[in-house]
Interface confidence: medium
Amino acid sequence: NSCELTNITIAIEKEECRFCISINTTWCAGYCYTRDLVYKDPARPKIQKTCTFKELVYETVRVPGCAHHADSLYTYPVATQCHCGKCDSDSTDCTVRGLGPSYCSFGEMKE
């Protein structure tokens, strides 16, 4: 296994102002051991383990406003510990090809 904390950039969208700001945070990335079994045990449902957070904290950043919109606060997750486990679809985008954390719907990025 090689599943560990890594620095990533995420885009926070300010929809009403049609721009994004990018911030640095920590998340989990890497590979997890998996077996593509020929003989499937009916007593053990197949769970594909992925590199995901074991523990996380939340941090808050101030997002600047624009013309008629005030500044706002945005809270984002920061992973503090990683492991190979089941992707929790209640809190995580577990799709095969998600848009990714740095995707911005708008052209403009503010530092």
Epitope: D36, D41, A43
Partner: antibody, heavy 116, light 107 residues
Framework: DVHLQESGPGLVKPSQSLSLTCTVT?????????WNWIRQFPGNKLEWMGS???????NYNPSLKSRISITRDTSRNQFFLQLNSVTTADAGTYYC?????????WGQGTTLTVSS | DIQMTQTTSSLSASLGDRVTISCRAS??????LSWYQQKPDGTIKLLIY???RLHSGVSSRFSGSGSGTDYSLTISNLEQEDFATYFC?????????FGGGTKLEIK
């Protein structure tokens, strides 16, 4: 190293039952993997018969489901095949094998002749 | 059941040659394909699993490829010990099924 060894009668009469034993050394059958019976007919065709898993659950080939039983003795690290109502069509070589991502360890095989 | 077809039942080649053995599944098996070698004495060995992953201790002269329904095993720089029968097996859907085998003979 993992080693599997089949044992049982080489000759069975039609309509009788076949009983085979697979003795596993070098790995516990309760630790992991599927423990399989696979047979090879005289024309070389291989057929998976069934598996008993480390968990104790079992899968059978639907084509044999009414005639086959796979059990195990965990204290002896052995698993067993019983095939009922054998006919001449069941003649061939019977292998026990360990299965995971592939069927990675096979016994040397035991030949079954069905004749009265 | 998924049918596995090895269209070539026997193949002749010389020492040092490179040969390719093919296997076709009756439906998409999503790379759940293994290759086995059977020697004349009946001994069976796993060579490759999940289409292209080499089993431990197997010579790197063996390689596997394919996707969907079509798969192949390539043996490069043939050695005397490679002359044997080769089987494919799908592990996508129960029951696991095998191809009819390809016998590799010395020319």
């Amino acid at each position: 190293d993992v080693h599997l060894q089949e044992s049982g009668p080489g000759l069975v009469k039609p309509s009788q039952s076949l009983s085979l034993t697979c003795t596993v050394t070098g790995f516990s059958i309760t630790s992991d993997y599927a423990w399989n019976w696979i047979r090879q007919f005289p024309g070389n065709k291989l057929e998976w018969m069934g598996s008993i898993f480390s968990s104790g659950s079992i899968n059978y080939n639907p084509s044999l489901k009414s005639r086959i039983s796979i059990t195990r003795d965990t204290s002896r690290n052995q698993f067993f095949l019983q095939l009922n109502s054998v006919t001449t069509a069941d003649a061939g070589t019977y292998y026990c094998a360990r299965g995971g991502t592939g069927t990675d360890y096979w016994g040397q095989g035991t030949t079954l002749t069905v004749s009265s | 059941d998924i049918q596995m077809t090895q269209t070539t039942s026997s193949l002749s080649a010389s020492l040092g040659d490179r040969v390719t053995i093919s296997c076709r599944a009756s439906q998409d098996i999503s790379n759940y394909l293994s290759w086995y070698q059977q020697k004349p004495d009946g001994t069976i060995k796993l060579l490759i699993y999940y289409t292209s992953r080499l089993h431990s201790g197997v010579s790197s002269r063996f390689s596997g490829s394919g996707s969907g329904t079509d798969y192949s095993l390539t043996i490069s720089n043939l050695e005397q010990e490679d002359f044997a029968t080769y089987f494919c097996q799908q592990g996508h859907t129960l029951p696991p099924t095998f191809g009819g085998g390809t016998k590799l003979e010395i020319k």
